[in-house]
Interface confidence: low
């Protein structure tokens, strides 16, 4: 009853959604196969081949625990742990091996359980080259005299839309938050719309190191102001890493419950479902842009 969520790595285990109901069960990924006969070649990497009417389904029943023990895959993506890497290999029916313990050096900030759906593939892995890892959309300028991470984020022309960020600073537009994050090479999140006020407390905001590894920066309990702490969002405790597959985990202390704030294009309780039905509109240079 109080074991870590999920189970051990590897295949097997029952999925509540049942056969083929992958939309209701994020742990069961089903891949349609063109081959009409179940054999070793039609369902590899730990998948279970199942005949389903005229076609086949390759069920990847991996019950992966959600602990953040990142590994870098041979496809250049960071996986939350080795089980997620194996599950991705099964899901896509392609070989993915562990090429490094720890996250891939990348600026895409993926690190999710399904890292293969983010980033740009193998070229990401050693993108840092001489620069060291450039994150938060920074690019390595190897031709520059002082080799380093360069930020080419252009925020000129953005409309005035002030926000309060996790570093306690106010920015005139969300774009400037991204720019600051890029320049400082550290995670800075938008806390709320509008300028920061005296009541804003940054002690609970935490920082995001790699992917879904949200770490509360709170060093002792006395720093936690009650008015912020109870009934408001705080970063999820570390043993909930991976609770949100494609989104940010937020924890409401008064209810002791986590909720997921999904990234654009994802939905579901754990932001595990791809949602192409939503048209996202964001302000950009005085005009509306479809994302």
């Amino acid at each position: 009853s109080n074991q870590p969520p999920g189970g051990g790595g590897g295949s097997g285990g029952d999925c509540p959604g049942g056969k083929g109901k992958s939309i209701n069960c994020s742990e069961l990924n089903v891949r349609e196969s063109d081959v009409r006969v179940c054999d070793e070649s039609s369902c590899k990497y730990g998948g279970v081949c199942k005949e389903d009417g005229d076609g086949l389904k390759c069920a990847c029943q991996f019950q992966c625990h959600t602990n953040y023990i990142p590994v870098c895959g041979s496809n250049g993506d960071t996986y939350q742990n080795e089980c997620f890497l194996r599950r991705a290999a099964c899901k896509h029916q392609k070989e993915i091996t562990v090429i490094a313990r720890g996250p891939c050096y990348s600026d895409n900030g993926s690190g999710s359980g399904e890292g293969e759906e983010e980033g740009s593939g193998a070229e990401v892995h050693r993108k840092h080259s001489k620069c060291g890892p450039c994150k938060y959309k920074a690019e390595c300028d190897e031709d520059a005299e002082n080799v380093g991470c360069v930020c080419n984020i252009d925020c000129s022309g953005y409309s005035f839309n002030p926000v309060c960020a996790s570093d306690g600073s106010s920015y005139n537009n969300p774009c400037f938050v991204r720019e600051a994050s890029c320049i400082k090479q550290e995670q800075i999140d938008i806390r709320h719309l509008g300028h920061c006020t005296d009541t804003d407390d940054t002690s609970l905001l935490g920082k995001k190191d790699d992917g879904l590894q949200y770490r509360p920066d709170v060093k002792d309990a006395s720093d936690q102001r009650e008015d912020v702490y109870i009934g408001n969002h705080m970063p999820c405790p570390e043993n909930l890493n991976g609770y949100c597959i494609h989104g940010k985990c937020e924890f409401i202390y008064s209810t002791q419950k986590a909720s997921c704030r999904c990234e654009s294009g994802y939905t579901g309780q754990h932001c595990e479902k791809t949602d192409f039905s939503i048209l996202y509109v964001v302000p950009s240079r005085q005009k509306l842009t479809h994302v």
């Epitope: 870590p4 060093k219 999820c236 570390e238 008064s254």
Partner: antibody, heavy 124, light 107 residues
Framework: QVQLQESGPGLVKPSETLSLTCAVS?????????WGWIRQPPGKKLEWIGS???????YYNPSLKSRVTMSVDTSKNQFSLKLSSVTAADTAVYYC?????????????????WGRGTLVTVSS | DIQMTQSPSSLSASVGDRVTITCRAS??????LAWYQQKPGKVPKLLIY???TLQSGVPSRFSGSGSGTEVTLTISSLQSEDFAVYYC?????????FGGGTKLEIK
């Protein structure tokens, strides 16, 4: 079977620093859970000292925070407690324990596994 | 800090009796409460968490109920091995705090 075992000196002089270590066997502390320290003065109730995660994130009891330092050594699968400037009031049985984990988006900060406890006496 | 007050502080009962121990919180704690049993010279043992969820391996004669500021632990039919000190602990808010304990003795 997961087991926790405290170790450290049973006698500490006033104003010195109390140092205890908790060795965990049967479970990798890097795999999850928070790990805590609780103490119990003779004949008195339990008092939470603080908790630590394998990354080093700590949560301390405000009443002790100025004197407490907790650390973790994942390579040795152990975590430690240091309590500085001790007085006779710090005489207690010190327990290390595993805190309940988060599941289904809900966290349970109770203690499901305890070490045997070690009596630390502060006396000159 | 949230203060946890247990009542009674001591209780005498006989084998087979039904016993109820109450834990009151100085402010609402929802159901974020655990109960522990501690025998003399022994380590505290988790009995119940989330106010009413029985920890694995704990006999079903133990049960918990309530939420908010008042939570109770009930032992439906006392056994000789149940005589011990019982502590409640809230985990709705840091710092985590324990009750003063209820000593359950043989009448």
């Amino acid at each position: 079977q997961v087991q926790l075992q405290e170790s450290g000196p049973g006698l500490v002089k006033p104003s010195e620093t109390l140092s205890l270590t908790c060795a965990v066997s049967g479970y990798s502390i890097s795999s999850g859970y928070f790990w805590g320290w609780i103490r119990q003065p003779p004949g008195k109730k339990l008092e939470w000292i603080g908790s630590i995660y394998h990354s080093g994130s700590t949560y301390y009891n405000p009443s002790l925070k100025s004197r407490v330092t907790m650390s973790v050594d994942t390579s040795k699968n152990q975590f430690s407690l240091k309590l500085s400037s001790v007085t006779a009031a710090d005489t207690a049985v010190y327990y290390c324990a595993r805190e309940g984990d988060c599941s289904g988006g809900i966290c349970y900060w109770y203690f499901d596994l305890w070490g045997r406890g070690t009596l630390v006496t502060v006396s000159s | 800090d949230i203060q946890m007050t247990q009542s009674p502080s001591s209780l005498s009962a006989s084998v087979g009796d039904r016993v109820t121990i109450t834990c009151r919180a100085s402010q609402g704690i929802s159901n974020y409460l655990a109960w522990y049993q501690q025998k003399p010279g022994k380590v505290p043992k988790l009995l119940i968490y989330a106010a009413s969820t029985l920890q694995s391996g704990v006999p079903s004669r133990f049960s918990g109920s309530g939420s908010g500021t008042e939570v109770t632990l009930t032992i439906s039919s006392l056994q000789s091995e149940d005589f011990a000190v019982y502590y409640c602990q809230q985990y709705n808010k840091w710092p985590l705090t324990f009750g003063g304990g209820t000593k359950l003795e043989i009448k």
